[in-house]
């Protein structure tokens, strides 16, 4: 090859200057002995190249691009060859930003998959290949002293979440967790979380059911609904509080919230509703009084209140 480009840096901050040099070897005898080296960025010719013959007979052209405003472009040096440009060499230039500090790192413990799932917001586009790594360690205390490191968790390309499997977790013991972002222009780290995986447990919601009418039980009062729920078995031993929400199926009414209910109530009579009206109901629960995350809302249960005008307007539950 007759020409070779070298650049001050192939990757720079967007808008920064970049200097490049193109050297043509002397033994390219078929070339004009005093060739004029031209520069092109993408499809555009770039003026301002300073050319000189070096002591060994090679020709060198140096150009400074004052602002690289393209996130990706090819810089080439070329010679006029008849009616066309003969490209001697080209390099890919990249421009972008160092990674911002990842923010809003949060984690959930999923007892079904036995994994701690952490997610974060990566921040603005860097325009450069940027890797994210979820880093963590075990700690006996409040994460001021670092215990055993845990294997790095690397998300799939483009994802901003990662799962730490059970074998790397210690329940009822704190872990230090943070995200490290890295690209060619720098490294940044999120603030560190210090958490016990059980304190971020997210339970599955109970399953709402219609209460089976029993011969000795009184039928629901007018404007009331009788319902029961089946707790999520794997979370049965975790103390929880729950809340119901309900709204008429027709119309634009917003959800009305009822709670807190103890998970153990298992059945409930909801009163103060419109008579002869179909309602949609859902339930969700959270570990309590210890820390945790609310479960998702349960699948909906649809029930209809009785025809007669309501006589009571209160909530109470039966054990």
């Amino acid at each position: 090859e007759c020409g070779h480009i070298s650049v001050s840096a192939p990757i720079v901050h967007l808008g920064d200057p970049i200097t490049a040099s193109c050297i043509i070897k002397q033994n390219c005898s078929h070339l004009d002995p005093e060739p004029q080296i031209l520069w092109r960025l993408g499809a555009e010719l770039q003026p301002g190249g300073r050319q000189q013959r070096l002591s060994d007979g090679t020709q060198e052209s140096i150009i400074t691009l004052p602002h690289l405003n393209h996130t990706q472009a090819f810089l080439s040096c070329a010679l006029n060859w008849g009616n066309s440009l003969q490209i001697l060499d080209q390099v890919e230039l990249r421009a972008g930003y160092p990674p911002a500090i990842p923010h809003n790192l949060s984690c959930l413990m999923n007892l079904t998959t036995s994994s701690l799932i952490c997610q974060w917001e990566p921040g603005p586009e860097t325009h450069l290949p940027t890797s994210f790594t979820l880093k963590s360690f075990k700690s006996r205390g409040n994460c001021q002293t670092q215990g055993d490191s845990i294997l790095d968790c690397v998300p799939k390309d483009g994802q901003s979440h990662c799962s730490i499997p059970r074998k790397h977790l210690l329940l009822y013991q704190n872990m230090g967790i943070w995200v490290q972002a890295e690209n060619a222009l720098g490294t940044s780290m999120s603030p560190q979380l210090c958490l016990d995986p059980m304190d971020v447990v997210k339970l599955e919601p109970p399953m709402l059911r219609t209460m089976d009418p029993s011969p000795e039980a009184a039928p629901p009062q007018a404007g009331c609904l009788q319902l029961s729920w089946e707790p999520w078995q794997p979370g049965l031993h975790i103390n929880q509080k729950c809340e119901l929400r309900h709204k008429p199926q027709r119309g634009e009414a917003s959800w009305a919230l009822v709670g807190p209910l103890p998970l153990e109530a298992l059945q409930y009579e909801l009163c103060g509703l419109l008579p002869a009206t179909a309602y949609t109901l859902q339930i969700r629960c959270i570990r309590w009084p210890l820390p945790g995350h609310w479960s998702d809302w349960s699948p909906s249960l649809e029930l209809r209140t009785t025809e007669r005008a309501p006589t009571h307007h209160h909530h109470h539950h039966h054990h």
Epitope: L111, T112, T113, S114, R166, K167, L171, M198, P231, Q233, P234, L236, H237, I238, N239, P262, E264, A265, L266, P289, H319
Partner: antibody, heavy 118, light 107 residues
Framework: EVQLLESGGGLVQPGGSLRLSCAAS????????MGWVRQAPGKGLEWVSS????????PYADSVKGRFTISRDNSKNTLYLQMNSLRAEDTAVYYC???????????WGQGTLVTVSS | DIQMTQSPSSLSASVGDRVTITCRAS??????LNWYQQKPGKAPKLLIY???NLQNGVPSRFSGSGSGTDFTLTISSLQPEDFATYYC?????????FGGGTKVEIK
């Protein structure tokens, strides 16, 4: 330190009744599920029953359903097992246990022997 | 109901040996598997819960692994005080069930 102390075991005739108690100390009793596990002489462990922290949920093993009743008194930090219609096959050491959030039997009492024999 | 099958039912080993006990559930139980140690005339003692979490105060030579239906308790270097009977137990739902036990004896 967590302590669980069972009492109430002894010799009883088939068809008879017995009430086991378990006095708990060293932890906030009202926050934990509790349970009974038994072990027949020379045999393995068999879960009998458990009770939720406030007493609202009480699952039983099929072998004792309808005959045994588990209960608790959170004001007295005490767990109970009322055993009626006792059979020879109920002869075992009965252990009281404190459960963890993942259903594990975290701490066990020393056990009380129940012998059903004529 | 979920059945728990432990193997072997007994084994002979020497101090310093690596010992492995397996437990199989009749259906998937995620990680809801606990291991207990019981010595003659004594109450059982929790060793490992949720498949791999070491209970406080239990020596680190005990470890647990597995998920779904197949689980393992490993004692990396058997000590004289480890000769006992070991039980697995599933805790994903009721009725609760224990394995039949594995008696670890001195060779």
């Amino acid at each position: 330190e967590v302590q669980l102390l069972e009492s109430g075991g002894g010799l009883v005739q088939p068809g008879g009744s017995l009430r086991l108690s378990c006095a708990a100390s060293g932890f906030t009793f009202s926050l934990y599920w509790m349970g009974w596990v038994r072990q027949a002489p020379g045999k393995g462990l068999e879960w009998v029953s458990s009770i939720s922290s406030s007493g609202g949920v009480t699952p039983y093993a099929d072998s004792v359903k309808g005959r045994f009743t588990i209960s608790r008194d959170n004001s007295k930090n005490t767990l109970y097992l009322q055993m009626n219609s006792l059979r020879a096959e109920d002869t075992a050491v009965y252990y009281c246990a404190k459960l963890g959030e993942l259903g594990q039997f975290m701490r066990w009492g020393q056990g009380t022997l129940v012998t059903v024999s004529s | 109901d979920i059945q728990m099958t432990q193997s072997p039912s007994s084994l002979s080993a020497s101090v310093g040996d690596r010992v492995t006990i397996t437990c199989r559930a009749s259906q998937g139980i995620s990680s809801y598997l606990n291991w207990y140690q019981q010595k003659p005339g004594k109450a059982p003692k929790l060793l490992i819960y949720y498949a791999s979490n070491l209970q406080n105060g239990v020596p680190s030579r005990f470890s647990g692994s597995g998920s779904g239906t197949d689980f393992t308790l490993t004692i990396s270097s058997l000590q004289p005080e480890d000769f006992a009977t070991y039980y697995c137990q599933q805790s994903i739902g009721y009725p609760g069930s224990f394995g039949g036990g594995t008696k670890v004896e001195i060779k």
